[in-house]
């Protein structure tokens, strides 16, 4: 988040009256973690295991197909975004275990916590690209027959990644390490110092571009797609709707706490009770957003099982079936699973 993420252990007697109990050593420390931090650690551990293994499997499955299958290109890029974010988790985990002490230096402070934001922007932009692709397949099938190719898909992905990097720059630039005098601790966070307006601007841009605008556009986009598929009596449309709703919902559900607390903290005074309360929940909100990095493979597997009736195949072949089936470019009743369902397995979970 953009307010300095420095939740401390419970030095209750320092926080309120700044008094030290004279019967205890001056540099006494607390070994207990707050409940939100413990929950964050559990989530981080699960996300890391599922995210690294799951996304590695998705990358492995889609990488071989990416030259000829456009859907594979989309899922490959989404999996790479999620996989990269998961690599930061051991460091973030270690920091929380040490009561948010950051012994990893300034460069790591700038890069690693920014990966989740890069993931958010990359994912949402890739999903917008995928959604545009789905939309064109339904409403401009002739154009797709002529121009929809792997080269264009890779260009679209490159643009999405470039924009994502650009949008992550503000948080990257303002991220600093600060060494607190007492209790002795190095903290990693974002410091806008005198520039509260800039902090608010960054938070608003993040909320609009990373949440509200995608929510609006994707809702409209899939409403049109689903209305068209239903009007053509496409098969498996109920299944499609469920998967689309699940995937879209996952993105917005898991990013909502992060976005809400982020925008609130940018408008609050750092010394206000509400700000301090939100700051204590910061790690939990970040970990909740991180669930997006491992949810995709889960959705693919669940969707794959749904398509197969039951899990009859090996995991890689099931994933290959879900992720690499090419869309049929026909504006007919055969616009079914291959076009809508394949798109649906992962259209919004980042």
């Amino acid at each position: 988040m953009d307010s300095f993420n420095y939740t401390t252990p419970d030095y209750g007697h320092y926080d309120d009256k700044d008094t030290l109990d004279l019967n205890t050593p001056v540099d006494k420390t607390s070994n207990t973690l707050r409940v939100p931090d413990i929950l964050a650690l559990v989530i981080f551990a699960v996300v890391f295991l599922v995210g690294v293994l799951g996304n590695a499997l998705v990358v492995w499955v889609t990488a071989f197909e990416a030259k000829r299958t456009i859907n594979a290109i989309w899922f490959l890029n989404l999996a790479v975004a999620d996989f990269l974010s998961c690599l930061a988790l051991p460091i973030l985990f270690t920091s929380i275990v040490q009561h948010h002490h950051w012994p990893f230096g300034g460069a790591a402070c700038s890069i690693l916590p920014s990966l989740i934001l890069l993931n958010m922007y990359a994912s949402i932009l890739l999903l917008a690209t995928i959604s545009a692709d789905r939309f064109l397949l339904v409403f401009k099938p002739i154009w797709c027959q002529n121009f929809r190719g792997a080269g264009l898909a890779w260009i679209a992905c490159a643009v999405a990644w470039g924009l994502a990097l650009l949008l992550t720059i503000p948080s990257f630039l303002y991220r600093v390490v600060r060494e607190e005098y007492f209790p002795p601790k190095v903290l990693c966070g974002v410091d806008y110092s005198h520039d509260k307006r800039r902090e608010r601007a960054v938070a608003i841009v993040r909320l609009v571009l990373g949440f509200l605008w995608p929510l609006l556009t994707l809702t409209i986009c899939y409403t049109f797609i689903l209305l068209r598929t239903w009007s053509r009596r496409a098969t498996r449309s109920t299944k499609t709707l469920k998967v689309v709703v699940a995937v879209v919902a996952s993105f917005f559900i898991f990013w909502l706490p992060y976005q809400v607390t982020g925008i609130m903290m940018s408008f609050l005074e750092p010394s206000s009770p509400t700000f301090l309360l939100l700051k204590k929940l910061d790690s939990l909100c970040v970990s909740f957003a991180y669930i997006n990095c491992c949810i995709n493979p889960i959705i693919y597997v669940v969707a794959g099982q749904g398509f197969q009736g039951r899990l009859r195949k090996s995991l890689p072949s099931l994933l290959r079936n879900v992720l690499t089936e090419e869309s049929v470019v026909r504006e007919s009743k055969s616009f079914t699973r291959s076009t809508v369902d394949t798109m649906a397995q992962k259209t919004q979970a980042v």
């Epitope: 004279l22 607190e180 007492f182 410091d191």
Partner: antibody, heavy 123, light 112 residues
Framework: QVQLVQSGAEVKKPGASVKVSCKAS????????MHWVRQAPGQGLEWMGY????????KYAQKFQGRVTMTRDTSTSTVYMELSSLRSEDTAVYYC????????????????WGQGTTVTVSS | DVQMTQSPSSLSASVGDRVTITCRAS???????????LHWYQQKPGKAPKFLIY???NRFSGVPSRFSGSGSGTDFTLTISSLQPEDFATYYC?????????FGQGTKLEIK
């Protein structure tokens, strides 16, 4: 009452070392941290670091790292600050100061100060 | 390091005047516990500094009520509501949130 009494003025040559003492009385020595702050002629105050007399833990400002050493003798309630490789810019009044509150320990501010020790570095 | 910038660097005033000294930190000095460790010290020539105000606005024991502090985040002020002869001295702001602890360059308050 609380008192911090420092050693007398020193004149040193460049490259030499100086050791300034600060004897504490009137309070429980190990309950309060001891800091050293210096003031060059006509200049402002500059924090050098602190020592926790209870544990012996020290923390020095980056600027003085490698040149300053703070030690304590709990039996005499005395803290020492040694500055090595002296240069002319080290000419200053050196203060020891306690971080603590009135009736309680508080590491965030300096409530009692020594009278200061003038260290002159001149060839 | 956090730079503490005081203004003005010197100030002439008369007994009974209301005086305001400002101090600006180069970055936020709000501690992770929510407190702001910004303090004010008074120093007279040839003497050790004396502690006046802690945590922005709290007077230390024995400090007259004419001394008051305010501010938040990065901008702070020390106000002397009615100057007394004994108040003519140099005033320093200091932060003890971040290492290294740093002081302002001082504001010398002189008799007009």
């Amino acid at each position: 009452q609380v008192q911090l009494v420092q050693s007398g003025a020193e004149v040193k040559k460049p490259g030499a070392s100086v050791k300034v003492s600060c004897k504490a009385s009137g309070y429980t020595f190990t309950n309060y941290w001891m800091h050293w702050v210096r003031q060059a002629p006509g200049q402002g105050l500059e924090w050098m670091g602190y020592l926790n007399p209870s544990s012996g833990y020290t923390k020095y400002a980056q600027k003085f790292q490698g040149r300053v050493t703070m030690t304590r003798d709990t039996s005499t309630s005395t803290v020492y600050m040694e500055l090595s490789s002296l240069r002319s810019e080290d000419t200053a009044v050196y203060y020891c100061t306690r971080s603590g509150g009135d009736n309680y320990g508080n590491p965030y501010y300096f409530d009692r100060w020594g009278q200061g020790t003038t260290v002159t570095v001149s060839s | 390091d956090v730079q503490m910038t005081q203004s003005p660097s010197s100030l002439s005033a008369s007994v009974g005047d209301r005086v305001t000294i400002t101090c600006r930190a180069s970055q936020s000095i709000v501690h992770s516990n929510g407190n702001t460790y910004l303090h004010w010290y008074q120093q007279k020539p040839g003497k050790a500094p004396k502690f006046l105000i802690y945590k922005v606005s709290n007077r230390f024991s024995g400090v007259p009520s004419r001394f008051s502090g305010s501010g938040s985040g990065t901008d702070f002020t020390l106000t002397i509501s009615s100057l007394q002869p004994e108040d003519f001295a140099t005033y320093y702001c200091a932060q003890s949130t971040l290492v290294p602890l740093t002081f302002g360059q001082g504001t010398k308050l002189e008799i007009k």
